[in-house]
């Protein structure tokens, strides 16, 4: 049994780091493998993660941690029984993938303005809470070419757009994702999408 693709890990910078790797053949990850992780610190101890299958030869493990700070560095040991298959390290702050925003809502009752709001996925005492910026994706269900991205570079989790920038009388969907420049993170996954029917009063034309 050998590791074909070494573990790569990302952290949500809150409570979970996810490591993925591939073995050289079909593997029952949960029965055959264990991933041990330990913070490099005098009081810490090793914890065991039981991996799940992620495709035939792929494995994924969710490492639990109560919090993350920028200096944290973990040792990782991948075991198959008594055989050490791989040894490495992981610094969560250097491999951050933020949590996806939630509760995306489209408010359509604000005088021909669409107000999109969502929730910051972090609690106020988490470092990322005040460092997230967002991208909002809006698309038409009827017209695949009607697809747009709005970058929200301010901290408030909301976006206002004129309803008239979208076509009237058709349905749209929106979703939002987050990233944090301070840790040069990857983008989060997209939030679940929300749907609304776009309608607005056409401006009265005077001749």
């Amino acid at each position: 049994m050998k590791v074909l693709q070494e573990p790569t890990c990302v952290s949500d910078y809150m409570s979970i780091s996810t490591c993925e790797w591939k073995m050289n053949g079909p593997t029952n990850c949960s029965t055959e493998l264990r991933l041990l992780y330990q913070l490099v610190f005098l009081l810490s101890e090793a914890h065991t993660c039981i991996p799940e299958n992620n495709g035939g030869a792929g494995c994924v493990c969710h490492l639990l941690m109560d919090d993350v700070v920028s200096a944290d560095n973990y040792t990782l040991d991948l075991w198959a029984g008594q055989q050490l298959l791989w040894k490495g390290s992981f610094k969560p702050s250097e491999h951050v993938k933020p949590r996806a925003p939630g509760n995306l809502t489209v408010h359509t009752n604000v005088s021909d303005t669409l107000l999109l709001t969502w929730s910051n996925p972090y609690p106020p005492d988490n470092y990322l809470y005040n460092h997230l910026t967002y991208a909002v994706n809006i698309w038409s269900e009827n017209d695949p070419a009607d697809f747009r991205i709005y970058n929200v570079t301010y901290l408030e989790p909301s976006l206002r757009i004129a309803a008239s920038t979208l076509k009237s009388g058709i349905s749209y969907r929106a979703r939002v994702r987050a990233w944090a420049q301070c840790y040069n993170t990857t983008w989060s996954e997209w939030s679940p999408s929300t749907k609304w029917h776009n309608s607005y009063r056409e401006p009265f034309e005077q001749h």
Partner: antibody, heavy 122, light 107 residues
């Protein structure tokens, strides 16, 4: 409410013994490293000892090694410090304190008791 | 043992002032440093852990920085309730050790 409450302090003669207790409430006591920290009158803070969640690891400052013993009873949510062969320099307020982290511990103390005074004097 | 040296030992300041306290370790401690505030007759209160991470509930005017041997606690705009003694503490190796303290007094 998360709380620690020390007891057992008092006046003791040099060479004497005391047993300090710390009652924990409002949190999962068995999940945290626990510490004793002392402060002599008008002086700074001095870490004395700590103990792992299950009691299997214990560490002490050199000046109390062989004289003080830290222990815990997770079933009673209690931390203890047995003080033997006391000397005048042990006179201090003794605080119990919780490590803020569980997974992982952080070596920083977020919950403190009100302290109990130990006076060693003849 | 790792010695922790705080400076200054005391500082006089006014409400609204920016106050900086430094802590130097006798050898490298990575980022394993905490800061505490203590008022007379009271137990210490944790402000910062791991050099720069905020303890929940601590006002944002307190911030910590540094790694290795040199660390700083900054109070961006001193408030009346901030007059107290501040201690740093290392957790890189046993025995855990505290700095001697810095007293912030009213000017």
């Amino acid at each position: 409410e998360v709380k620690l409450a020390e007891s057992g302090g008092g006046l003791v003669q040099p060479g004497g013994s005391l047993r300090l207790s710390c009652a924990a409430s409002g949190f999962t006591f068995s999940s945290h490293w626990m510490n004793w920290v002392r402060q002599a009158p008008g002086k700074g803070l001095e870490w004395v000892a700590n103990i792992k969640q299950d009691g299997s690891d214990k560490y002490y400052v050199d000046s109390v090694k062989g004289r003080f013993t830290i222990s815990r009873d997770n079933a009673k949510n209690s931390l203890y410090l047995q003080l033997n062969s006391l000397i005048a320099e042990d006179t201090a307020v003794y605080y119990c304190a919780r490590d803020r982290g569980v997974r992982p511990p952080r070596g920083a103390f977020d919950i403190w008791g009100q302290g109990t005074m130990v006076t060693v004097s003849s | 043992d790792i010695q922790m040296t705080q400076s200054p030992s005391s500082v006089s300041a006014s409400v609204g002032d920016r106050v900086t306290i430094t802590c130097r370790a006798s050898q490298g401690i990575s980022s394993w440093l905490a800061w505490y505030q203590q008022k007379p007759g009271k137990a210490p209160k944790l402000l910062i852990y791991a050099a720069s991470s905020f303890q929940s509930g601590v006002p944002s005017r307190f911030s910590g920085s540094g790694s290795g041997t040199d660390f700083t606690l900054t109070i961006s705009s001193l408030q009346p309730e901030d007059f107290a003694t501040y201690f740093c503490q290392q957790a890189n190796s046993f025995p855990l050790t505290f700095g001697g303290g810095t007293t912030v007094e009213i000017k």
